[in-house]
């Protein structure tokens, strides 16, 4: 990936709207050292995006990609 | 493909106040931030401020009682509003994208820029 | 506000490894500045090279590399070529807002 990289991620604000379920196939949460606590989702095309993890479309989405 | 497209007055006489549109096209308002940044003749980048996809803003805290920024994610278009304009605010503004990420590069894609001259 | 200050030109030949630096006057940068460096070229033309201290953006040569050198950022072009004769601004985080350098004048002789 170009964004390879040994420092950690962290998400400066987060999407407003929510992103297709099909188009993503994983998630991690930021670590806790992040200023703003996140979830990134990463899509089929490995681009990552920053959500609030307090909104529910977000924990639908966890849930969904845990059981999946 | 990204493009952000930046229009503005071109002449604005001192005390008055200045807006500059920026259009932006190949992404969503609601996925990214937009940021200003200007740059006097013959000086550096100095760093405006921003808007993030859910409308919180963040400042350069030297110039935020004058700066206002805002935007209208359905037409695609972000504004910058700065008041009390002085002779020493003629630059070149410019609208870049910011993605959300932090191990991602800030300002990716920058606008072509318009030129501000504040004048009499 | 912070104060970011980087070389104000360098000059080196085809072929030649190059570093620039951003220093800020708060202190060491760390990871946490998220260091970024944009290059303009004539016409106002700006891109980003590099976010995040150290990742390339997508399409930027990889003779273009971030790094932390003792308490400075770091870009080093390993290899210059003639086009990479630029300015090259860097940029630093500072919880809330960013802070650009003055700017390092890159010139590429040959």
């Known amino acids: 990936s170009p964004y390879s990289s040994d420092t950690t991620p962290c998400c400066f604000a987060y999407i407003a709207r929510p992103l297709p379920r099909a188009h993503i196939k994983e998630y991690f949460y930021t670590s806790g050292k992040c200023s703003n606590p996140a979830v990134v989702f990463v899509t089929r095309k490995n681009r990552q995006v920053c959500a609030n993890p307090e909104k529910k479309w977000v924990r639908e989405y966890i849930n969904s990609l845990e059981m999946s | 493909q990204v493009q952000l497209k930046e229009s503005g007055p071109g002449l604005v006489a001192p005390s008055q106040s200045l807006s500059i549109t920026c259009t932006v096209s190949?992404?969503?308002?609601?996925?990214?931030?937009i940021h200003w940044v200007r740059q006097p003749p013959g000086k550096g980048l100095e760093w405006l401020g921003v808007i993030w996809p859910g409308g919180g803003t963040n400042y350069n805290s030297a110039l935020m009682s004058r700066l206002n920024i805002s935007k209208d994610n359905s037409k695609s278009q972000v504004f910058l509003k700065m008041n009390s304009l002085q002779t020493d605010d003629t630059a070149m503004y410019y609208c870049?994208?910011?993605?959300?990420?932090?191990?991602?590069?800030?300002?990716?894609?920058w606008g072509q820029g318009t030129s501000v001259t504040v004048s009499s | 506000q912070a104060v970011v200050t980087q070389e104000s030109a360098l000059t080196t030949s085809p072929g030649e490894t190059v570093t620039l630096t951003c220093r800020s006057n708060?202190?060491?940068?760390?990871?946490?500045?998220?260091a970024n460096w944009v290059q303009e070229k004539p016409d106002h033309l700006f891109t980003g090279l590099i976010g995040g201290t150290n990742n390339r953006a997508p399409g930027v040569p990889a003779r273009f590399s971030g790094s932390l050198i003792g308490d400075k950022a770091a870009l080093t072009i390993t290899g210059a070529q003639t086009e990479d004769e630029a300015i090259y601004f860097c940029a630093l985080w500072y919880s809330n807002h960013w802070v650009f350098g003055g700017g390092t004048k890159l010139t590429v002789l040959g």
């Open positions: 708060t202190g060491a940068v760390t990871t946490s500045n998220y």
């Open positions: 190949g992404f969503s308002l609601t996925g990214y931030g």
């Open positions: 870049a994208r910011g993605p959300l990420i932090t191990t991602e590069v800030s300002m990716d894609y």
